[in-house]
Interface confidence: low
């Protein structure tokens, strides 16, 4: 049988000769050289060589346990003469024995970590880990202990776990934000002679809201023209906050002051400035200076820091209203004037007045905006604002004229204002009444006297105050010996009546009746209209059967008054 124990070999041998491993030996070996020892398996013939006569094994190269801790080989003992094994082939192990030849190595060369500023002592920051390639099962070669080389008194490290914690109270980011901590990991349990490695931990203090906003000055002064419309920005104020991010966000508000209703403050989210804006229309003549109390506050507050004081600050803002040359102001928002349509050119209609509202009371001059009166029907006295006609008017063409008058400061023509003028043209009886339509009617040959054959209507372009009152009569030249009479109905209509029994169409086929229509206004206007009456043959119901050929030209006229 084979005679050996497990072989052990120290790693990292540095001698000049081959390193002796051990001896393979069979109890069949009589020492006469009849046996031949053969080695096979891990590293056989290369790393490990055997003296085939004696069975002595040597390592030819320096071995590293951390590279390969165990070699498995096979041993054979053969009878040289017969070539037969004298022992069964057997597996054996060469175990590489550890020495402390590896220092601890951290998993990262550089660690980065953050921890909130003002954290309590002992707050976890980060855990670092170092590993040692040596054999952890034998001795202390791989037993690592952590210590802090740089970073005290701010941070500490737990020797066994590598957990870094805060070690100092009230670390303030605003005072110092970045820390570089150096941690050492040492094997041999930290004892003398142990190997070590280091890592750097970059620790950043993150911000907490431990600082209130602060105005850099107690008073701000701005000025704005009185003409500034609501929404106009007039100045910017800025409180500073040592914190960052949302902890440095600031909201501005007006908390007090006589300008509370007149101004607003809005927060510019990008610049964190407070923009003072006009809220209501200002008037230099009423109030020249306003004072506001503006507050800057953090919208997000951490209750644990409230003991530091209120997270807000206030400043006084003084706003001076500047006088602005304001445009003239008319005495009315609009003027309504009226004038008779028969007014002569240069007739004064009325006047407008405007005055400069400024303290200077600059004189004004007037003009008509020709966009609104391109035909120049009206003119204005530039000095006193009197409006007068420059052309003849006609109510029946245009009842209302809408024009715009401009008042301009003489000393500053850029300052002007406008007012609408509504000019009503009053009616004058300058149009005669006339027939509402063309009248062409017919009479039956067998008509009886006083028979109504047509009703007449009249129209008049004028518009008298008391309404139209028309009168109708036959023209004087036709009144005597007429075959028809006009009956005025006194309701602005008249009827044409037959004056005799029977008409002969062969004797007279057509009658032309001149009718005078007059109105009842001053001065009286009248016109003469002609009614054509055809004589027609009718049936016994009075329906037209045949007429003079001309009468058929206007069938619509023939159908009336039948």
């Amino acid at each position: 049988s084979w005679m050996w124990n497990q072989f052990f070999l120290l790693e990292e041998y540095t001698g000049s000769d081959y390193q002796y491993v051990g001896k393979l030996h069979s109890d069949q070996d009589r020492g006469d050289g009849s046996l031949k020892y053969i080695l096979s398996g891990d590293g056989a013939g290369d790393l490990f060589i055997i003296n085939e006569n004696t069975g002595d094994i040597q390592a030819t190269k320096r071995l590293d346990r951390e590279e390969k801790p165990v070699y498995i080989l096979r041993a054979q003992a053969i009878n040289r003469r017969t070539g037969r094994p004298v022992e069964p082939e057997s597996e054996f192990i060469i175990k590489i024995h550890d020495i402390n030849d590896n220092e601890p190595i951290f998993t990262k060369e550089v660690y980065t970590a953050t921890v909130p500023e003002m954290s309590d002592v002992g707050t976890f920051v980060v855990q670092v880990t170092a590993t040692d390639a040596d054999d952890p099962t034998y001795g202390n070669s791989a037993k690592v202990v952590y210590s802090i080389l740089q970073g005290q008194p701010y941070f500490s490290v737990e020797s066994e776990t590598g957990i870094i914690k805060t070690a100092l109270l009230n670390m303030d980011r605003e005072n110092r934000e970045q820390y570089q901590v150096v941690i050492q990991a040492k094997d041999m349990g930290g004892q003398m002679g142990g190997l070590s490695g280091t890592t750097t931990v970059n620790i950043t203090l993150t911000d907490v809201n431990d600082n209130p906003p602060r105005f850099p000055q107690s008073t701000y002064q701005f000025k704005t023209p009185e003409s500034s419309p609501p929404g106009t920005p007039i100045g910017r104020i800025k409180a500073s906050d040592a914190d960052v991010g949302e902890n440095a966000e600031i909201e501005y508000s007006i908390t007090d002051g006589e300008g509370l209703d007149m101004f607003d403050v809005i927060t510019d989210q990008e610049t964190q400035e407070g923009i003072i804006t006009v809220k209501k229309l200002l008037d230099f003549e009423k109030k020249k200076v306003y004072t506001l109390k503006v507050e800057a506050s953090n919208p997000y507050v951490e209750p644990r820091f409230l003991y530091l004081g209120p997270f807000k600050d206030s400043a006084t803002v003084r706003i001076v209203v500047e006088d602005v040359d304001e445009p003239p102001v008319f005495s009315k928002l609009a003027y309504i004037l009226q004038i008779r349509e028969d007014a002569q050119i240069n007739t004064t209609i009325g006047s407008v007045t405007a005055q400069d509202p400024d303290a200077a009371r600059n004189p004004v001059k007037y003009s008509v905006d020709r966009h609104t009166d391109m035909d120049r029907i009206f003119n204005i006295d530039s000095g006193n604002g009197s409006i007068f006609t420059s052309k003849l008017l006609d109510r029946e063409t245009l009842l209302w004229h809408n024009i715009t008058v401009i008042a301009t400061e003489i000393n500053n023509p850029k300052q002007s204002s406008r007012v609408p003028l509504y000019i009503k043209v009053l009616d004058v009886n300058d149009n005669a009444p006339e027939f509402a339509e063309f009248y062409e009617t017919f009479v039956c040959e067998k008509a009886k006297a006083d028979q109504l054959i047509q009703t007449l209507h009249a129209v008049d372009k004028d518009d008298p105050y008391s309404g139209h009152q028309f009168s109708f009569s036959l023209a004087p030249e036709a009144a005597s010996g007429s075959n028809f009479t006009i009956q005025d109905n006194k309701d602005n209509t008249a009827g044409i009546l037959t004056r005799k029994n029977g008409y002969n169409r062969h004797e007279m086929s057509t009658y032309l009746l001149p009718v005078v229509i007059s109105d009842n206004d001053y001065p009286v206007q009248s016109s003469t209209g002609t009614v054509t009456v055809r004589v027609c043959a009718c049936d016994h119901h009075g329906n037209m059967q045949s007429c003079h050929a001309e009468a058929l030209i206007h069938p619509t006229g023939l159908s009336t008054g039948a």
Epitope: S367, D369, R370, D375, R376, N379, S382, G383, S390, I406
Partner: antibody
Amino acid sequence: QVQLQQPGAELVKPGASVKLSCKASGYTFTSYWIHWVKQRPGQGLEWIGEINPSNGVTNCNENFKSKATLTVDKSSSTAYMQLSSLTSEDSAVYYCTIPNLLWWYFDVWGAGTTVTVSS
Amino acid sequence: DIQMTQSPASLSVSVGETVTITCRASENIYSNLAWYQQKQGKSPQLLVYEATNLADGVPSRFSGSGSGTQYSLKINSLQSEDFGSYYCQHFWGTLWTFGGGTKLEIK
């Protein structure tokens, strides 16, 4: 900017007619009256008349009523003045001009068209 | 029609002198008056409007005055570029007319 373009010159025979043009640009054509002014060589300025491009209404100096006819073509923003029965008295520079609508002075003038009546 | 009478018709003056040109209307034109300057071969250029207002870019040596029917244009300390013809024009009523003009020549 506001501009009034006029052709440089027109040569016409006595007794004939000529139609002068004035092309407007840079503003709303129908918003301003267009006026015409005559200037004989070495003489002063004579106001001929005006036309409202929006409705064609005209006002003319009595002396030119039978001589000048003012028209417009809104589609091309052009005003025209036709001079008829030309004589040597009509040889002149003819300007078109538009007035400022607030104060009614002539602040934009064309360069003028020189009309020469000669056989 | 309103007639405009301008005087003098011509004027011969030296650089540096002050001149006044007048214009009389046949009736009240309520300051609706303009003054123009015209150089040989050029279109007229506006100097003054509404009787007293200086047009943009016109030197302050020019000034207009007057009201009612009497108006004048004054040029202080004449410069060489001021020589040329000057015209008044009224804008009152429907028909507008120019004055006869004043020719300003270098003495």
